[in-house]
């Protein structure tokens, strides 16, 4: 349905307040170093001209694509250049090529201060003084600071920060009220936004199809009484909607997603009794509701997939007619049958499908050579089960921090050209899967634990893309993104490293570690102990083990020391010369 | 969509030869193996014979063995069946079809041996 003006069509169809923040997500997403005033003051400028083309769509410019307003509008910036290089050039091309560009410049690890906390009473001042300004500053820090973070999610975030400073500012102890609340919201909002970075990356990576498969297994497996033709129509949009918001198109985007919603809440008889109570909430609960949902409960009867998918003589035929939809129907059969399976497995039983299907009905006999296929899949569904187990009973037995530990030593082992901080941001994230995931029953894990090591090491992947080191991390990133987990899996010690220069200063540690909260100091520790790995990566557990039990022991006495400083400084000395004698250096 | 279009068929006398053939079109024709079928009247569908993808590997039902050659030109889509020696228990209608599917397609080209 075209419409003469697109601003106009998308500022009314939003309202103003969803406009104007959506526009400013927009531009923090593709600017991120650009100060909050200035942004203000261009979101002010296209709200602005929204409001004269809805007076009158023929008005000059209404006619204009979204693109083009914005991009001309971010082009406007004076100090484009001296701020952001080479991204200028972007003002130079053409739509749709100008977008393509600012798209590209997106940094995944922007340059920016850590956002730091004020005290409860100086946020409740400012959130008193100026309510708008203070919740669009909040926009502003988490889209500059995460630039694929689904634009309609930040918007119920931002409704939730508003929420707990609107309660909390007026309690007792304001801060026994809003800290908890504002430390979810921070954890919550780094998964989603890591989530989101995933959906992106398979967009933009590995194309639609890629995408397409992986909602067809999600929701197959969130809605098994929905038909195919259901479960298609939703991923179909769902696909319209991320590719929207991945591409920049924010408007776009959370308008589609509001439509979705509303359908999915029309038609829920037809796709899942667990919504009822989603579809009863406002439009941005809903929406994230809708999303988070429990699977439904299987039909009951659901026949054996070989009738269809193995003994059936018109595999073949079906398969020739439509490729897309017969592997569609088969990842839809499969997963509505297997919520405990991850969707990552899913996906990779239909390759192996697709994959002795493109051979076998190539043969003269085509039943003869598939019909063993199934027999293919038992070793790919146990490989997880598998590691899941192993990685579970050690996280049992050390508990999380020991477990990240283990997990930093591993990948370092495996990677060591890629950066400290990455390594050690990455494995303190791949060791969360033990306390996110290892609680739950056999049926849960795997799809709560491989879904979610996708995300974790899909940050690995962005961040590795911007700075190149390792061949083995581009290798497992792009080939293919439904074998990273196997892939990353499978690597063994790089033998072709050169060990690390020993350098005293990466282990010099001052009386400020003393004063850390317990993540902070857990993260110097992980810190030193990947540097230790970088410089002796042949080093056994049982080395690495002793030597961070004495750096513990140091730290923990040092902080009680009465000159800490003194004490960092000649105790540090010895334990550098103790770890040095104690791996070899 | 996917057309499978027979020709060929016709009447013929005992020891006489016909070449069917079969026009694909709406899918990758290179990238399957086909096979014919045939139904006399009253009967149920019987397999007669099917190829791999590149033509490489031919297959027969033991009741058309060294009479009948099954044969395709991937560069026009095309499947082939040559029939020697022919004899009244051949006549039925021949279909093609993908893989060895049992559904029927296409009409089918009607081969009647008779004298």
């Known amino acids: 349905d075209a419409h003469k003006s697109e601003v106009a069509h998308r500022f009314k169809d939003l309202g103003e307040e969803n406009f104007k923040a959506l526009v400013l997500i927009a531009f923090a997403q593709y600017l991120q170093q650009c100060p909050f005033e200035d942004h203000v003051k261009l979101v002010n400028e296209v709200t602005e001209f929204a409001k004269t083309c809805v007076a009158d769509e023929s008005a000059e410019n209404c006619d204009k694509s979204l693109h083009t307003l914005f991009g001309d509008k971010l082009c406007t910036v004076a100090t484009l250049r001296e701020t952001y290089g080479e991204m200028a050039d972007c003002c130079a091309k053409q739509e749709p090529e100008r977008n393509e560009c600012f798209l590209q410049h997106k940094d995944d690890n922007p340059n920016l201060p850590r956002l730091v906390r004020p005290e409860v009473d100086v946020m409740c001042t400012a959130f008193h003084d100026n309510e708008e300004t203070f919740l669009k500053k909040y926009l502003y820090e988490i889209a500059r600071r995460h630039p694929y973070f689904y634009a309609p999610e930040l918007l119920f975030f931002a409704k939730r920060y508003k929420a707990a400073f609107t309660e909390c500012c007026q309690a007792a102890d304001k801060a026994a009220c809003l800290l908890p609340k504002l430390d979810e919201l921070r954890d919550e909002g780094k998964a989603s936004s890591a989530k989101q970075r995933l959906k992106c990356a398979s967009l933009q990576k590995f194309g639609e199809r890629a995408f397409k498969a992986w909602a067809v297994a999600r929701l197959s497996q969130r809605f098994p009484k929905a038909e195919f033709a259901e479960v298609s129509k939703l991923v179909t949009d769902l696909t319209k909607v991320h590719t929207e918001c991945c591409h920049g198109d924010l408007l776009e985007c959370a308008d589609d997603r509001a439509d979705l919603a509303k359908y999915i809440c029309e038609n829920q008889d037809s796709i899942s009794s667990k919504l009822k109570e989603c579809c009863e909430k406002p439009l941005l609960e809903k929406s994230h509701c809708i999303a988070e949902v429990e699977n439904d409960e299987m039909p009951a009867d659901l026949p054996s997939l070989a009738a269809d998918f193995v003994e059936s003589k018109d595999v073949c035929k079906n398969y020739a007619e439509a490729k897309d939809v017969f592997l569609g129907m088969f990842l839809y059969e499969y997963a509505r049958r297997h919520p405990d399976y991850s969707v990552v497995l899913l996906l990779r039983l239909a390759k192996t499908y697709e994959t002795t299907l493109e051979k076998c009905c190539a043969a003269a006999d085509p039943h003869e050579c598939y019909a063993k296929v199934f027999d293919e899949f038992k070793p790919l569904v146990e490989e997880p089960q598998n590691l899941i187990k192993q990685n579970c009973e050690l996280f049992e037995q050390l508990g999380e921090y020991k477990f990240q530990n283990a997990l930093l030593v591993r990948y370092t082992k495996k990677v060591p050209q890629v950066s400290t901080p990455t390594l050690v941001e990455v494995s303190r994230n791949l060791g969360k899967v033990g306390s996110k995931c290892c609680k739950h029953p056999e049926a849960k894990r795997m799809p709560c634990a491989e879904d979610y090591l996708s995300v974790v090491l899909n940050q690995l992947c962005v961040l590795h893309e911007k700075t190149p080191v390792s061949d083995r991390v581009t290798k497992c990133c792009t080939e293919s993104l439904v074998n990273r987990r196997p892939c990353f899996s499978a690597l063994e010690v790089d033998e072709t490293y050169v060990p690390k220069e020993f350098n005293a200063e990466t282990f010099t540690f001052h009386a400020d570690i003393c004063t850390l909260s317990e993540k902070e100091r857990q993260i110097k520790k992980q810190t030193a102990l990947v540097e230790l790995v970088k410089h002796k990566p042949k080093a056994t557990k049982e080395q690495l083990k002793a030597v961070m039990d004495d750096f513990a022991a140091f730290v923990e006495k040092c902080c009680k020391a009465d000159d800490k400083e003194t004490c960092f400084a000649e105790e540090g000395k010895k334990l550098v010369a103790a770890s040095q004698a104690a791996l070899g250096l | 969509e996917v057309q499978l279009v027979e020709s060929g068929g016709g009447l013929v006398q005992p020891g006489g030869s016909l070449r069917l053939s079969c026009a694909a079109s709406g899918f990758t024709f290179g990238s399957f193996g086909m096979s014919w079928f045939r139904q006399a009247p009253g009967k149920e569908r019987e397999f007669v014979s099917a190829?791999?993808?590149?033509?490489?590997?031919?297959r027969y039902a033991e009741s058309v063995k060294g009479r009948f050659t099954i044969s395709r030109d991937n560069s026009k889509n095309t499947l082939y069946l040559q029939m020697n020696s022919l004899r009244a228990e051949d006549t039925a209608v021949y279909y093609c079809t993908i893989g060895r599917s049992a559904s029927r397609w296409g009409q089918g080209t009607t081969v009647t041996v008779s004298s």
């Open positions: 190829i791999d993808s590149g033509g490489a590997d031919t």
